[in-house]
């Protein structure tokens, strides 16, 4: 079982390989000096049907380096970064993992593209392995909370409360959504 020629790449090169390309072979892409690689650099020759070989993912692309590009902090609810740090320049990558009791959908790594957006795929999502969710927490008078979604929240996530200037937070600042579908504490209050 073997794979066909790896997909070509513009403004880059492919690592050496011999033919036929055996299942299990890895080929690596790189870009010319003034270009940046966007996407996974390694492709693996696999077989899904034990008859034909196929490449396990699409080839990356080489983008002309844009020194003015910069990408925003990527946020994955229920996940955290295991690689990558700000500032995010063209060609930089960020890799995510999911918190305990969350499973990942999508590709764990994304790249900062010339258009200031993360790609070539969407940010991964971390999905709670528990069907239970915590109900939406209320806003508090003279204060705010960090929850981005107004609907229910998956176990493992947390909400942080803060008070407006001149008010004091009484109670728990951070409230966690437990695997039972209940909140770890009642919302705090903001008092003068």
């Amino acid at each position: 079982i073997s794979c066909g020629s790896p997909p070509p790449i513009l403004n880059g090169r492919i690592s050496y390989y011999s033919t036929p390309i055996a299942v299990g072979t890895v080929i690596r892409y790189s870009c010319s000096g003034t270009f940046r690689l966007i996407g996974e650099k390694s492709l693996l020759c696999i077989t899904k049907d034990k008859v034909d070989g196929t490449w396990d993912k699409p080839a990356p692309k080489c983008e002309y380096f844009n020194k003015y590009s910069s990408c925003p902090e990527p946020i994955v609810p229920g996940g955290y970064k295991i690689r990558g740090s700000t500032p995010y320049r063209h060609g930089d990558s960020v890799t995510f993992a999911c918190k305990t009791n969350f499973s990942m959908n999508g590709n764990k790594s994304v790249w900062c593209q010339a258009n200031n957006m993360w790609g070539p795929t969407r940010l991964p999502t971390c999905v709670s392995v528990f069907p239970l969710e915590c109900p939406a927490l209320p806003m508090i008078h003279n204060g705010h909370h960090t929850s981005e979604n107004v609907g229910s929240i998956a176990p493992g996530l947390s909400v942080t409360y803060s008070c407006e200037s001149g008010y004091l937070l009484v109670g728990e600042k951070i409230i966690n959504c437990l695997s039972s579908g209940k909140w770890s504490a009642v919302p705090p209050t903001c008092e003068e």
Epitope: R13, S15, Y16, Y17, S18, V23, G24, V26, R28, S30, E40, S42, L44, I46, T47
Partner: antibody, heavy 119, light 106 residues
Framework: QVQLVQSGAEVKKPGSSVKVSCKAS????????ISWVRQAPGQGLEWMGR????????NYAQKFQGRVTITADKSTSTAYMELSSLRSEDTAVYYC????????????WGQGTLVTVSS | EIVMTQSPATLSVSPGERATLSCRAG??????LAWYQQKPGQAPRLLIY???TRATGIPARFSGSGSGTEFTLTISSLQSEDFAVYYC????????FGQGTKLEIK
């Protein structure tokens, strides 16, 4: 970090076979590749082959083709290397090493297994 | 098979001084090169990958450079724990190691 724990030292007769195990803990066993690298006494490192457990695919260095078999048991997160038709030149420390995401380099290594081939 | 050649075979340097180790590939390997450190009775430890990226937890005194066929590992100020054998490894086409450079105390 992934921990790789190998089986103990072996003494074998020429012509026989040896099977060395490498148990992984931490990380997702099926998502990385395990290579076997050997080192004869006072010598350098020599790549023998590798397996990608999730695919069950093994590839071997030409020098060892036909004499080495690398397998993996996903249920126990264990990789195995069997070397047959042993000769005295096969006396070496055998290491398993982990490669993440087809990176090509080895972040984690087993402690090594000394295989002595002697009559 | 891509042949990797390291030089010198043995390098004698005093603690606090700079050490420069070389690795040459038999054909271009782009930047697909790793460096390992090995001490007696221990498994190798990854120092550098992709020719110049330090692995997690590796001190800043270790640096790698080069691309194509010529590569260098530099240890800026040698500590007592740095005296060991160093191996380069290519991963452009499967995997091969250099024969090693022994770094000893002068």
């Amino acid at each position: 970090q992934v921990q790789l724990v190998q089986s103990g030292a072996e003494v074998k007769k020429p012509g026989s076979s040896v099977k060395v195990s490498c148990k992984a803990s931490g990380g997702t066993f099926s998502s990385y590749a395990i290579s076997w690298v050997r080192q004869a006494p006072g010598q350098g490192l020599e790549w023998m082959g590798r397996i990608i457990p999730i695919l069950g695919i093994a590839n071997y260095a030409q020098k060892f083709q036909g004499r080495v078999t690398i397998t993996a048991d996903k249920s126990t997160s264990t990789a195995y290397m069997e070397l047959s038709s042993l000769r005295s030149e096969d006396t070496a420390v055998y290491y398993c090493a982990r490669e993440d995401d087809s990176s090509g380099y080895y972040q984690d290594w087993g402690q090594g297994t000394l295989v002595t081939v002697s009559s | 098979e891509i042949v990797m050649t390291q030089s010198p075979a043995t390098l004698s340097v005093s603690p606090g001084e700079r050490a420069t180790l070389s690795c040459r590939a038999g054909q271009s390997i782009n930047s697909y090169l790793a460096w390992y450190q090995q001490k007696p009775g221990q498994a190798p430890r990854l120092l550098i990958y992709d020719a110049s990226t330090r692995a997690t937890g590796i001190p800043a005194r270790f640096s790698g450079s080069g691309s194509g066929t010529e590569f260098t590992l530099t240890i800026s100020s040698l500590q007592s724990e740095d005296f060991a054998v160093y191996y380069c490894q290519q991963y452009e086409y499967w995997y091969t190691f250099g024969q090693g450079t022994k770094l000893e105390i002068k």
